[in-house]
Structure formats: C-alpha cells, structure tokens
Amino acid sequence: SEVEYRAEVGQNAYLPCFYTPAAPGNLVPVCWGKGACPVFECGNVVLRTDERDVNYWTSRYWLNGDFRKGDVSLTIENVTLADSGIYCCRIQIPGIMNDEKFNLKLVIKPAKVTPAPTRQRDFTAAFPRMLTTRGHGPAETQTLGSLPDINLTQISTLANELRDSRLANDLRDSGATIRIG
C-alpha cells in the first residue's frame, strides 16, 4: 500500500512528506527512517528534526524544502541500488500514539545506457528494443525496455517486527494529524 517513487542510479531521489504547522515556526519533530514505520518511533533513523532545526542527519540524506513551513521531504543524494526499499516519514505531534506515519517505497533502476552517437546504428540493429520507454508511477522515468527489472532482495528492516517495547528515547512521544492546530 506504499506510494512508489523511482530514481536512477547516480541521481538524487526525492521522497515527499509534508505537514501544516499550526503557526509559522510552530514546528513538530519529524523522523525519517529506513524501513516501514514501526509501531513507535522510526527504525534505522537517517534524519531527524526537532521543534527548531534538523538535529540529526547522515551523509547523503537531507531536506531540500523549507522544513520550517512543513516541507520535510527527503532527498537522497547519488542513489545506488542499495537505497531501494521502504522509507518512513513520521510526524510526531504531541499527544498519545498519534503519529502521522507515511511509508514510501523507493525503487532504484540501473542508469540508462547512452550509446555513443557513432555506434548508434550498430547498437540498435543488435538490440532493436533497447530504446523502448516505459513510464513508472509518480515520478516517471525512462528505462531500457529489453532489460529485465533487477530483482532486488528486500533489505531487512524493523518494519516487519513491530516492536512491543519502545526504545527509551524522547522521539517516541507522539504525533497527530497532518494538519496541526
């Protein structure tokens, strides 16, 4: 049931996530994790914000939008096949067990093969279907039609092991509706 987003190896991937702050600057904590949203918190956290700022991030993961206006969309720089999988955006609004949780599926495709112009005729003669294009999901990309999709082994996450007991840290608090206030 996750929404699917696509990118090619070497590109930046974009995973959208938004909320509406009750008032300008009235921010709530958000965490991004690799793996579907567990019952509590984020598993395998890659980026985290608090009420004021981004307070934790790992290399290649950043917020490109204006997170102070509720744009907490994640950008992953220079993706590889290993970046494929489910990501959790968790909006942690104060309260009891009211997190807004969004699971987004990132599919990474191999980079397009761009043949050298002088070899074009030979290339297309040998591979007549190579220039077929196919559209994919929310972020449409072009792929080489005759190449099989890479069958990626799903990266194991905490997602399927909904934790009965939470980690004792401050980010398990809460969270609520996407519109705050």
């Epitope: 049931s1 579907a36 949203c37 019952v39 104060p94 309260g95 009891i96 067990m97 009211n98 997190d99 807004e100 949780k101 969004f102 699971n103 909904l162 009965d164 007991s165 939470r166 004792a168 398990r172 608090d173 809460s174 969270g175 609520a176 509706t177 996407i178 519109r179």
Partner: antibody
Framework: EVQLVESGGGLVQPGGSLRLSCAAS????????INWVRQAPGKGLVWIGW????????KYTPSLKDQATLSTDKAKNTAYLQMNSLRAEDTAVYFC??????WGQGTLVTVSS | DIQMTQSPSSLSASVGDRVTITCKAS??????LGWFQQKPGKAPKTLIY???RLVDGVPSRFSGSGSGQDYTFTISSLQPEDIATYYC?????????FGQGTKLEIK
C-alpha cells in the same frame, strides 16, 4: 476536524458475534493508529487492541486475542472490531480512538439472552 | 503485561482543594504515561501525556509528574467541573494498560 463515529452495537445473544464500525473523518485515515477500548458498566477502561490502517498491522490484549479481530476498509475510512463468542462479561461500551487523543462517542454492546 | 496500580479508588474534596492521584507501574515505563478525565456517559479526554506534558487547551491547574515506576497527577485548585473519574495509562509497551480509575467527588 477529527471525528470518529462508532456503530453496530446492540443486543446480542451469548455465543453470538458482532462487528462494530468506526467511521473516521477529518484526517488521513491510512496514516494514523486506531485503538479500541471498552468499558463495562460502572467499571474502568480496558484496552482491546491497535491497528495501523496503512498496512493492517495489529496488536491485541492477550485476554481478547482469540475473540477480537481488528480490520480496516481504507476506501471507506472505516475501522472494524469483530467480536466472537460473546459472553455476558463482554457487555460494555466500546470506543475507538485515533491514537488515544481523539475518541468516538462509544457504542453499547449488551450480551444477554 | 505491565500492571498499573492507581490510588485512591475514590476521593472527596472541596472546591479549591489540591487533589493528588498516584499511579505505580509494575516496571519502568520511561515516562510513557498519560492521564485521562472521563465524565459520565462521555468518552475519555486526554489531559496529560509523557507524564508531565499538558495537552493544548487543558487548564493549567492540571499537572503531572514522575518517572520510572511512580507517577502523580495533581489538580492544584479543584473546580466543580473537575468532577469526573481519572485514569492513568501506560503506553510504553503493548498491551497498553490503564489504572483502575479514581472517582473524584465534591464534598
């Protein structure tokens, strides 16, 4: 505005079954937890279980695990509690809640012959 | 399962009094404790979450404190509209468990 409206309560024979509905509105149904809680007449609150509509994950209180089943219909923004093998002691008001901050009004289930 | 022992089960106080209710968990719940107010025929209403954080819109006369296994809920100056039953809840782990409730009455 977040709203939860329960329905489906009423009189049930011992040994019977009942499916309660919880219609949600005013928020993104698939992204928030739903909890079910019940309260027998004159008694305290008892947590029944939890479901995340986004992926259908569930948790139950051990004493009701074999009797209660939680589910959702994302197209209808509705959560369901199915209760089987009902006994007199299952007579209670049943509440659904978005997280545990927004509650429905409750629906009364009476188990009696 | 985590047991929540709430006391007293009932209490009678006068308008303006300071009222205190306690909840003890059978193990450390890392301050993942909420307090609810329930009036007859109504759904519970969240007052406090994370042991000491007041829900927006709840009067400041309500407060919570505690850590580990021991938690306290206080009404600094009892008002007539505070007559209700109060429950604690631990949400540190499943199954979630409520205290038995404290019925508050006016003298």
């Amino acid at each position: 505005e977040v709203q939860l409206v329960e329905s489906g309560g009423g009189l049930v024979q011992p040994g019977g079954s009942l499916r309660l509905s919880c219609a949600a509105s005013g928020y993104t149904f698939t992204s928030s937890d739903i909890n079910w809680v019940r309260q027998a007449p004159g008694k305290g609150l008892v947590w029944i279980g939890w479901i995340f509509p986004g992926d259908g994950s569930t948790k139950y209180t051990p004493s009701l695990k074999d009797q209660a089943t939680l589910s959702t219909d994302k197209a209808k923004n509705t959560a369901y509690l199915q209760m089987n093998s009902l006994r007199a002691e299952d007579t209670a008001v049943y509440f659904c809640a978005r997280g545990l901050d927004y509650w429905g009004q409750g629906t009364l289930v009476t188990v009696s012959s | 399962d985590i047991q929540m022992t709430q006391s007293p089960s009932s209490l009678s106080a006068s308008v303006g009094d300071r009222v205190t209710i306690t909840c003890k968990a059978s193990q450390d719940i890392n301050s993942y404790l909420g307090w609810f107010q329930q009036k007859p025929g109504k759904a519970p209403k969240t007052l406090i979450y994370r042991a000491d954080r007041l829900v927006d819109g709840v009067p400041s006369r309500f407060s919570g404190s505690g850590s580990g296994q021991d938690y306290t809920f206080t009404i600094s100056s009892l008002q007539p509209e505070d007559i209700a039953t109060y429950y604690c809840l631990q949400y540190d782990e499943f199954p979630l468990t409520f205290g038995q409730g404290t019925k508050l009455e006016i003298k």
